[in-house]
Interface confidence: low
């Protein structure tokens, strides 16, 4: 494989003249700070760039914004400032953009030392803007309603929480002493509030509410919560013990009616949990170690999010920055990616393909040597950097990417070796969901996936010198075409492109300097004009995902269905066009035992696919037997694996046992743990709950 | 700017006990592991402890556990070290450094003036 | 436990020469986790090299390192006459956590 021009790679030669009739420059005339991007609606060409300059002085900082529109994706601008009243935007706040394709945009502006602030709002992708005064001084971004975009929910820097029916004209207070508020389905909110000192003096003593009907009315659905979150079709709350100052998980999937114990550990005040992923079928759980170690457990939920499978030790996710580098890899069903730390303190990266249920390390790039980490040269494994090596301010200028319309491929910066390496990564990439990998680029990139992945582009990181080159690939990585966009380098800051990964259009960004001052400046290239033909029919193959062993009948089976792809021959230069659409094939597997997993009570002894009684229970399984629900305490020992479809094949049907039996002990029975009950809050401090998927924190 | 400066050394006589403090400045001090390193008279150096950055967790050399006790004040922003029984070879310059990070190793890339701790009867 | 050994003890070199000192682990270390320090008399050792190669903030980049398993060496192209000093090989991520090695003393010729 070339990363350079070379015989190998002859079909894109000539490119220069091609792609320099459609790269367009645009130098934005202000001083440089920083800048925040932000594409609104889907196929529209509108993108809004807002540049923030920050200088403070004595005792307050003193700014300037400047937003600028461009309808033709990036490749020319307009200064809109005027629009917004030369105010300076909060850029910590960024650009809130209205869900689907409403056209919807608010900016918040900073109004230092006033007792509110002011919005400046559109309806129209940004072309006008109304400015609205706020009675209060919002603490984070407005957040709009998923289902209706007119309504808006905010929270001020006093902790009210503030609700808006008709696009920030007008706002009514909801409620006083609120520390997390968040939209649910339809007009839902769930709140916490605080009844003594402060959000940090309650935490485990704060109150759960929920309106249905954008605070008509409220009604308590939990007390002494330490902190909730909403993951697919599940709320989670963290509820503090009666007897100590531990915490644990309970579920509702009924919007908080009624609430299970979730059968995972508790943990104390320094240790936290988090939902790495959800969706309506089941939940990744993060359950910190005690003491500071850096790492936790992930277990995975079963369809109620109430039984949990141990799925991984040592999951590094750091207390301090809050880091993990666990990674949905969304161009394939099932595969997710993240790191262990190991018993030496070194990093490895470990990947499932089938939601879970068992992890391996990444196999060896066939055109990689092992490096200095590894004990055997003729053994090791790629081991990927995400956002603890970002984090940690390594050379590793993007996270791993992929794209759920780019069918199985991900690109990420790596070293192969039986560790992370702290020395300079390559990028790599698989085009298929993870399961092989070959070094793409030398080096550290930028990358960004175009066209549904039927175009790649690199730009090569350079912290000390200028950038004026672009390397682009229509074969998935293999080849590598370089095309110098500007004779005078920028000081590159990143690559952008459309969200979604169908656009043909990338825009490099980046600044200038000039002896007074510094200037940023893009370029946007559109590469229509070197791939002209539309993808047809010949273009495409059939591509078995999951496909370890074609000899197997049930080759490809991954949660008891395969599914046949349509994708794009590696030799087709063609478009896939923005109206796109993944073509897939499902067909249903036979059941085997590997398709359920052990229920309440029972386990898999190792290098065993059975489900056996577990003969006593003990730790957070008996703990289940004091809090859990009655009706959770009968089962035959199996739960299909949420999101599992397959058919016929093993039945593991045995005689239904109840398990009440085995929960007798010497403890007294505490009363049920629901919404209503009282008692004295236990402990404060600690660590938050990160109960966001995306790791999107919040932090008091 | 960054800084970390030992104090509490002296003389002890063989047995006797001492603690030392480093008080740091200029950084989070709690996002840091810390450490304990020695340098006896015209000899090399020698790590002595380390703690975690919430102070959960505490590593010894074998030559001091047992005897010495690492902690931390993250209140304080100060580190500390108990020495007891001690002996004629604990006597050494000690230094108060910062490491770095889970999981890679940037090295202890600051380090106090060090304090001299003498045990001698 | 692993062993570090610095060589030569001591180098005689001057002002404008080239210095590279070894030092050897008695079993394999990753690379990610040697570290290189200077020590100049009655001062604090100050971190010049981590991860074997990459250099410490501020530290000029007449200072390389270079190495993995059990060879690793601490380059300095153009000596200047600050750097006459003691340098120190470092290893973390085995029991005991931190092991040094003995020093190699870079002395004016």
């Known amino acids: 494989r070339s990363t350079e021009q070379g015989e190998s790679c002859s079909g894109l030669l000539g490119a220069d003249a091609k792609l320099a009739g459609n790269t367009h420059q645009h130098i934005f005339n202000d001083l440089s700070g920083s800048v925040s991007l932000a594409w609104v609606g889907d196929g529209t060409g509108v993108i809004l760039a807002l540049t923030t300059f920050q200088v403070p002085i004595f005792m307050i900082t003193i700014g300037q914004s400047k937003l600028y529109r461009s309808e033709d994706y990036g490749k020319s601008f307009e200064d809109v400032t005027n629009l917004i009243n030369n105010t300076f935007i909060r850029s910590d706040f960024g650009i809130a953009i209205g869900p689907e394709n409403s056209g919807k945009v608010i900016l918040t502006a900073d109004v230092s030392g006033s007792h509110g602030s002011r919005i400046f709002v559109s309806s129209d992708f940004g072309k006008s803007f109304t400015h609205q005064e706020l009675p209060f001084v919002p603490l984070m971004q407005i957040t709009y309603n998923p289902e209706n975009s007119n309504v808006l929910l905010a929270l001020s820097n006093k902790n009210e929480l503030w609700l808006s029916e008709d696009f920030g004209t007008n706002w009514k207070k909801l409620y006083d002493a609120v520390c997390l508020a968040k939209w649910g389905s339809d007009n839902t909110i769930f709140f916490t509030t605080y009844a003594n000192g402060s959000c940090k003096a309650d935490l485990g003593a704060l109150e759960l509410w929920r309106t249905s009907d954008l605070g008509k009315s409220f009604k308590t659905i939990g007390v002494k919560i330490y902190s909730f979150g909403l993951g697919g079709r599940f709320l989670f709350a963290s509820v503090m013990a009666d007897k100590d100052t531990t915490r644990r998980i309970h579920v509702s999937t009924d919007q908080g009616d009624t609430w299970s114990m979730a059968q995972l550990p508790s943990v104390g005040q320094e240790q936290f949990y988090s939902i790495l992923a959800a969706n309506d079928d089941m939940v990744f759980m993060h359950v910190d170690e005690p003491g500071d170690t850096g790492f936790g457990t992930i277990f995975t939920s079963d369809d109620r999010g109430i039984v949990y499978s141990k799925s991984l030790d040592r999951h590094l996710y750091t207390t301090t920055g809050g880091e993990t580098d666990f990674t949905n890899v969304t161009s394939l069903r099932g595969v997710y990616i993240t790191s262990v730390l190991s018993e030496d303190n070194s990093i490895q990266t470990m990947i499932t393909f089938d939601q879970g249920g068992r992890w391996t390390h990444l196999r060896k790039p066939e055109n990689s040597e092992c490096d200095a980490t590894a004990k055997n040269k003729n053994e090791c494994s790629l081991h990927i950097h995400a956002s603890y090596s970002i984090s940690q301010k390594l050379n590793v200028p993007m996270a791993p990417l992929s794209e759920p319309n780019a069918v199985g491929i991900v690109i990420a910066h790596g070293s192969v070796g039986d560790a992370i390496s702290v020395m300079v990564p390559d990028v790599y990439i698989s085009d298929d969901g993870g399961y092989s990998w070959t070094k793409m680029l030398e080096g550290p990139h930028h990358y960004a996936i175009l066209d549904s992945g039927g175009l790649l582009v690199a730009v090569e990181q350079n912290a000390h010198q200028g950038v004026n080159q672009i390397k682009f690939s229509t074969d998935e990585g293999q080849c590598w075409g370089v095309y110098n966009f500007t004779k005078d380098p920028i000081f590159f800051t990143g690559l952008a492109s459309e969200p979604g990964a169908r656009s043909m259009n990338v825009s490099l960004w980046g600044y200038r300097s000039s002896l007074f001052h510094q200037y940023w400046i893009s370029f946007t290239i559109d590469f229509r004009d070197l791939i002209t033909r539309n993808c047809e029919e010949k273009d495409y193959t059939i591509w078995l995902a999951h496909s370890t062993d074609p000899e197997d009948y049930e080759d490809g089976c991954i949660l008891g269905y395969k599914e046949q792809f349509l994708r794009l021959r590696k030799s087709s230069v063609c478009q896939n066009g923005r109206d796109y659409v993944v073509t897939k094939q499902p067909s249903i597997c036979l059941c085997s035992l590997e398709d359920f997993l052990c229920d309440f009570g029972y386990y898999r002894p190792e290098n065993d696919s059975k489900c056996v009684e577990q003969p006593e229970l003990k730790g957070h399984d008996l703990e289940f037997c004091l809090y859990g629900r009655e009706e959770h305490l009968t089962t035959n020992g199996y739960r299909k694996i949420p999101g599992d479809k397959c058919q016929g094949g093993v039945n593991p049907v045995r005689e239904v046992k109840d398990l009440k039996k085995k929960c007798t002990s010497n403890f007294l029975s505490p009363e049920k743990q629901n919404s209503k009950s009282n008692g004295s809050a236990g402990g404060s401090g600690g660590l938050n709950d990160i109960f966001e998927a995306q790791k999107i924190e919040w932090h008091e | 700017e960054v800084q970390l400066l030992e104090s509490g050394g002296g003389l002890v006589q063989p047995g006797g006990s001492l603690r030392l403090s480093c008080a740091a400045s200029?950084?989070?001090?709690?996002?840091?592991?810390m450490n304990w390193v020695r340098q006896a008279p015209g000899k090399g150096l020698e790590w002595v402890s380390a703690?975690?950055?919430?102070?959960?967790?505490?590593y010894y050399a074998d030559s001091v556990k047992g005897r010495f006790t690492i902690s931390r004040d993250n209140s304080k922003n100060t580190l500390y070290l108990q020495m007891s029984s001690l002996r004629a070879e604990d006597t050494a310059v000690y230094y108060c450094?910062?490491?770095?990070?889970?999981?890679?190793?940037?090295?202890?890339?600051?380090w106090g003036q060090g304090t001299t701790v003498t045990v001698s009867s | 436990e692993i062993v570090l050994t610095q060589s030569p003890g001591t180098l005689s070199l001057s002002p404008g020469e080239r210095a590279t000192l070894s030092c050897r682990a008695s079993?394999?270390?990753?690379?990610?986790?040697l570290a290189w320090y200077q020590q100049k008399p009655g001062q604090a050792p100050r971190l010049l090299i981590y991860?074997?190669?990459s250099r410490a903030t501020g530290i000029p980049d007449r200072f390389s390192g270079s190495g993995s398993g059990t060879d690793f060496t601490l380059t300095i192209s153009r000596l200047e006459p600050e750097d006459f000093a003691v340098y120190y090989c470092?290893?973390?991520?085995?029991?005991?956590?931190?092991?040094f090695g003995q020093g190699t003393k870079l002395e004016i010729k």
């Open positions: 450094t910062r490491g770095r990070g889970i999981g890679y190793y940037n090295g202890m890339d600051v």
């Open positions: 200029g950084f989070t001090f709690s996002s840091y592991a």
């Open positions: 703690i975690s950055g919430s102070g959960g967790s505490t």
């Open positions: 079993q394999s270390v990753s690379s990610s986790y």
């Open positions: 991860g074997a190669s």
């Open positions: 470092q290893q973390y991520g085995s029991s005991p956590m931190y092991t």
